[in-house]
């Protein structure tokens, strides 16, 4: 019914879904039928797709309706063209004529908007034994004004970063460690300089790569380990080393020795495999009494790390397999046997 | 849509070895981490480990450490487990998992692989 | 390493009861970086994987119907099934995003009567 719908002047922050334009065109054939229904379709100046035309099939009238957010920034004025057809093919030698077509011209105004991160999250892996000072990150966003941003941290609650409010370059300020937890999770801010200080946020993981800053240790409490004394045989046992670092690639291949040469003559230690050794008597003359014996562990990494351990073991007079004290001779009785 | 797709099941001998698949589509797949779980028969889930494929880092449970390795293949979307020394108790349903987007849930599941060691 | 403990380990709920289960963090899942909780939920119908349901203790994945709420802040928290349905038949993970390794709970059990 009408070719020109003249301009219309809309916010770029119009709700996605508001109908912004009603248009109407009219089919002479009979009514609702395949050969009046009218379906309207933008044909030009659209080419984002943020526009869209819902039809009444009763009234044959059009809404377009915004599907995608409006743009300033890309697309300020654009000449829109739809054409109005049937679902149906025209008879043949019948042709879509000027009368099928219309336009309008879409304004877009511009709206001060907050900047915009380039991701939602920001991801960075470092090793926790890295230099205070190090570059463990960056951030980038931009706002659509074209104004400069300021980028700051909230949430640092460990205290472990500073941001370069110009560049988005994440550097650290203390000690890192991933027995704190990892990842690390802080909020960046980027708020535009000047304007109204619109900002946005978005987020920073720092995921924290183990180094080997754990020595080893006992894997579990060995006191009340005990032999029936005399031995009537070298006797040995089992004990587990472990460490809190985080082995990655492999598991943990401690090594083991002895904690001093002076115990060569009545202990040996021997690995059983990455984790176990077997601490064993050279021979059976024990006192009855707790020796205490000192074992070395080292990890092997990189740097190695290494845990002087004790044994407490006790040589003790058994009665059933346990050890014996006469009523009152000592408190801490052993009870494991071995 | 994303797609996480893994062999239905794989019998293997104690003390084998074995390298289970899992091959993405509907996403950039060097975008989001790739992890591993394990279900035994009428238990729980427990995570393996995890494979960030933009650069190959792993993160492993402990508890599998010596057991899983964790590979990608980025230029066929493709993320492998490979279970080694096999045991009764390695049978289970292995599956793979998505990330999630902007942080470190599982969104997207594989079928599931079930794995069982049998001489 | 962060230990879950959810129970009931089973209920069994007849169609419409509002059904309540309970998931249990050894440490405190609340970042006090982004205020956000890192707890999720998913749903395991049998011979069937696993489906989240819920991220975040309380964002609902698209496409899980709002009968299905996540509760709860800290170390405590709650899968609600407001209304629940014969297809709601499944094993319900919870699992802490927070912190290297992930940890899952044992699961709850649902049996609709």
């Known amino acids: 019914e009408k070719s020109d719908y003249g301009n219309l002047t809309l916010a770029e922050d119009t709700n996605i879904g508001s109908t912004i334009l009603t248009i109407q065109a009219t089919d002479a054939d009979e009514p609702f039928t395949g050969s009046s229904k009218i379906l309207y379709h933008i044909i030009k100046g659209d080419s984002e797709g943020r526009l869209g035309v819902d039809t009444d099939p009763h009234t044959n009238t059009g809404y377009v309706i915004i599907k995608k957010p409006l743009d300033f920034e890309t697309a300020a004025v654009s000449n829109i063209v739809f054409k109005a057809e049937n679902p149906e093919p025209l008879v043949f030698g019948v042709k879509y004529n000027a009368s099928s077509f219309a336009k309008f011209t879409l304004i877009v105004t511009d709206v001060n908007e907050a900047p915009q991160f380039s991701q939602h999250v920001f991801q960075a892996k470092v090793s926790e034994d890295v230099a205070i000072g190090t570059k463990v990150g960056n951030v980038t966003a931009k706002d659509p004004e074209g104004l400069d941003i300021s980028y700051s941290l909230r949430g640092d609650t460990r205290g472990w970063l500073k941001i370069d409010h110009v560049t988005g370059e994440i550097f650290s300020v203390a000690p890192l460690d991933r027995e704190a937890g990892s990842p690390y999770r802080v909020q960046v801010v980027a708020t535009e300089v000047g304007g109204s200080s619109l900002s946005s946020v978005s987020e920073f993981h720092l995921i924290l790569m183990d180094v080997n800053d754990n020595p080893p240790r006992l894997a579990k409490d060995y006191t009340g380990l005990f032999f029936c004394h005399p031995l009537s045989a070298p006797g040995s046992l089992i004990f587990e080393a472990t460490d809190d670092d985080q082995h990655l690639f492999r598991g943990p291949h401690f090594t083991f020795s002895l904690g001093s040469g002076s115990l060569q003559n009545d202990w040996e230690v021997s690995k059983i495999n990455g984790t176990h050794a077997r601490l064993s008597t050279r021979h059976t003359e024990f006192e009855e009494r707790e020796y205490v014996v000192l074992i070395r562990i080292n990890d092997g990494g990189r740097p190695p790390l290494e845990g002087i351990v004790s044994l407490p073991v006790t040589f003790c007079s058994c009665v059933e397999g346990s050890c014996f004290r006469p009523a009152g001779h000592q408190t801490g009785i052993p009870t494991v046997g071995m | 849509q994303v797609q996480l797709q893994q062999p239905g099941a794989e019998i293997v001998r104690p003390g084998a070895s074995v390298k289970l698949s899992c091959k993405a589509s509907?996403?950039?797949?060097?975008?989001?981490?790739m992890n591993w779980v394990k279900q035994r028969p009428g238990q729980g889930l427990e995570w393996i480990g995890a494979?960030?494929?933009?650069?190959?880092?792993?993160n492993y449970n402990q508890k599998f450490k010596d057991k899983a390795t964790l590979t990608v293949d980025t230029s066929s979307s493709s993320a492998y487990m490979q279970l080694s020394s096999l045991t009764s108790e390695d049978s289970a349903v292995y599956f793979c998992?998505?990330?999630?987007?902007?942080?470190?849930?599982?969104?997207?599941w594989g079928q599931g692989t079930t794995v069982t060691v049998s001489s | 390493d962060i230990v879950m403990t959810q129970s009931p380990s089973s209920l069994a709920m007849s169609v419409g009861q509002k059904v309540t289960m309970s998931c249990k963090s050894s440490?405190?899942?609340?970042?006090?970086?982004?205020?956000?909780?890192?707890l999720a939920w998913y749903q395991q119908k049998p011979g069937q994987s696993p489906k989240p349901l819920i991220y975040?203790?309380?964002t609902r994945e698209s496409g899980v119907p709002d009968r299905f709420i996540g509760s709860g802040s800290g170390t405590d928290f709650t899968l609600t099934i407001s209304s629940v349905q014969a297809e709601d038949l499944a094993l319900y993970h919870c699992?802490?995003?927070?912190?290297?390794?992930?940890?899952f709970g044992g699961g709850t059990k649902l049996e609709i009567k």
């Open positions: 509907g996403y950039t797949f060097t975008d989001y981490w």
């Open positions: 494979i960030d494929p933009s650069d190959r880092y792993t």
């Open positions: 699992q802490q995003h927070h912190y290297f390794p992930w940890t």
């Open positions: 440490q405190n899942l609340l970042s006090s970086g982004t205020q956000k909780n890192y």
């Open positions: 998992a998505r990330g999630g987007y902007g942080d470190y849930w599982f969104a997207n």
């Open positions: 975040f203790a309380s």
